[in-house]
Amino acid sequence: GCDRNCGLITGAVIGAVLAVFGGILMPVGDMLIQKTIKKEVVLEEGTIAFKNWVKTGTEIYRQFWIFDVQNPQEVMMNSSNIQVKQRGPYTYRVRFLAKENITQDPKDNTVSFLQPNGAIFEPSLSVGTEADNFTVLNLAVAAASHIYPNPFVQVVLNSLINKSKSSMFQVRTLRELLWGYTDPFLSLVPYPVSTRVGMFYPYNNTADGVYKVFNGKDSISKVAIIDTYKGKRNLSYWESYCDMINGTDAASFPPFVEKSQVLQFFSSDICRSIYAVFESDVNLKGIPVYRFVLPSKAFASPVQNPDNHCFCTEKIISKNCTSYGVLDISKCKEGKPVYISLPHFLYASPDVSETIDGLNPNEEEHRTYLDIEPITGFTLQFAKRLQVNLLVKPSNKIQVLKRLKRNYIVPILWLNETGTIGDEKAKMFRSQVTGKINLLGLIEMILLSVGVVMFVAFMISYCACRSKTIK
């Protein structure tokens, strides 16, 4: 009798020990995970995060769709709606260069760097060549007439526009439109002005920054968050809190991301900080990620979202701040009338697109999203979509703009910048992060469940034996 009872008690004790061990392993394991993650996401030499941060291991592509104007004469002569036809994608590989001038500052636990710009055309991922021609708005004419509303100067500009045989629209190659060309009208200005014009001019051999971000050594909750941009904590483009540089650069976020979080990030492309909210759980190459999206609320007018009041900088084009879905970034573009929106004016008010025919906004194709691995905070997949537009206004002094009867926010192009973790990197991530966490979770669950089952089973057996013996 004793042998059997002792065996049952021993089994129950072993079960209890296993269950307790499994239970203890939960917080202890979480602590170990947190400790490892905290160590590895710090932006300093030797960590996994630092290696991937210096030079992204992911191939990033920027696809362009150009809005080819189908009726230039009709618009110029009759102020008709602009008929556009998008052509693309024309794909470039971007962000392949390592960060430069990386400098750690141990005093305030920050690291500063420059992000060099470079673009390599990918013919195999494009519908045509860089020599393809497009009819687009004349960038210099639209910009000059906006920068110089002065009637006297507009007469001077008109003389130069006419002499150079420039018009409201122009035919340019993809390479010229994106990366720059010498403008014939600006070439006639008898002062030293930049005569090169392009949607992304200058780009190659330039760099974005200097960025100064927290390296996370003192507080992991601050890792990758921007401290200063170009030496300042503010942009000087907007009023009040709209001018603040918030969050990270969206390549990563502080670890242990919660679904309830609002992820703030700064994008120099749009000259502002913006935010993303959780949308859904996604499985990316076997890695569970959270999909965060830019909500329509971020593009709303101050009438719909009072928080956006400081992004409304003028009253006329915005119809007294009631228009939505477009952002006037002229202050950030040396006064050029550049407006940023989502592609095809997704989430924009009808008045914005009423002068343009041929647009088909579509949430799936045209919204921006970030797929974030919640434990590390790394962005493993993203699609940044934006449209660049130029404002053109009537001018009674400039012949080629004289017959316009209304303002146009003219779409020039839209882009889709995407990056997805590669298969090899995903495999490595699964084995090093997801795999280990899953294994630890599995061990915890096995220990706990086996322990509990053993304890309960042996205790029941023991009790049953005891009651038999008593009888």
Epitope: P149, N150, P151, F152, V153, V155, V156, N158, S159, L160, N162, K163, L188, V189, P190, Y191
Partner: antibody
């Protein structure tokens, strides 16, 4: 070095005509456009006429419209002011001046036009 | 036409004085205002354009301010060579118009 030199001023009877010249050097007049500004004795400055760059539009003060004509000969890099039906109130020192954005960065030394019988 | 009203029409000052001349436009001209200095028998000389931008070679004691309709030319410390007549001019709209001038004389 940028220089503007006016000539052609003198004494003329009311109703008469005179042609002023403005010879430019150191820059191309067609790129900038040329203005004529006058100053009656002991009075302030009065803008008279302007020829826009590259032979663009011509503009005149109301007081001279229909009587004065501005022109330019790009081959000679010279601007002209043809003044017809002259009146006593046209008596002034006439300056030619260079401008692109509407302010005058270079001026000639001036030429005196006297309208008197 | 845009009228430019200058005040005062004349002023007396001593070397080293701070001198302020004002100019008012009859309508908004943004920052499209220039200031000139003219000495007897000479052509005017550009001092300031775009209301505040000092022309090259002009001493830094000259400064301009203002926007919209009200503009000011300031000479921080008057020098003997600064005794002259000063004109403002709007370069916003044709016809280009000048103020009637301010004569700065020795006290």
């Amino acid at each position: 070095e940028v220089q503007l030199v006016e000539s052609g001023g003198g004494l003329v009877q009311p109703g008469g005509s005179l042609r002023l010249s403005c010879a430019a050097s150191g820059f191309t007049i067609s790129s900038f456009g040329i203005h004529w500004v006058r100053q009656a004795p002991g009075k302030g400055l009065e803008w008279v006429a302007w020829i826009a760059p590259y032979g663009g539009d011509e503009y005149y003060a109301d007081s001279v419209k229909g009587r004065f004509t501005i022109s330019a000969d790009t081959s000679k890099n010279t601007a002209y002011l043809q003044m017809n039906s002259l009146r006593a109130e046209d008596t002034a020192v006439y300056y030619c001046a260079r401008s692109f954005f509407g302010y005058f960065d270079y001026w000639g030394q001036g030429t005196l036009v006297t309208v008197s019988s | 036409d845009i009228q430019m009203t200058q005040s005062p029409s004349s002023l007396s000052a001593s070397v080293g004085d701070r001198v302020t001349i004002t100019c008012r436009a009859s309508q908004d001209v943004s920052n499209w205002v220039a200031w000139y200095q003219q000495k007897p028998g000479k052509a005017p000389k550009l001092l300031i354009s775009y209301a505040t931008s000092l022309y090259s070679g002009v001493p830094s004691r000259f400064s301009g301010s203002g926007s919209g309709t009200d503009f000011t030319l300031t000479i921080s410390s008057l020098q003997p060579e600064d005794f002259a007549t000063y004109y403002c001019q709007q370069h916003s709209n044709a016809p280009l118009t000048f103020g009637q001038g301010t004569k700065v004389e020795i006290k």
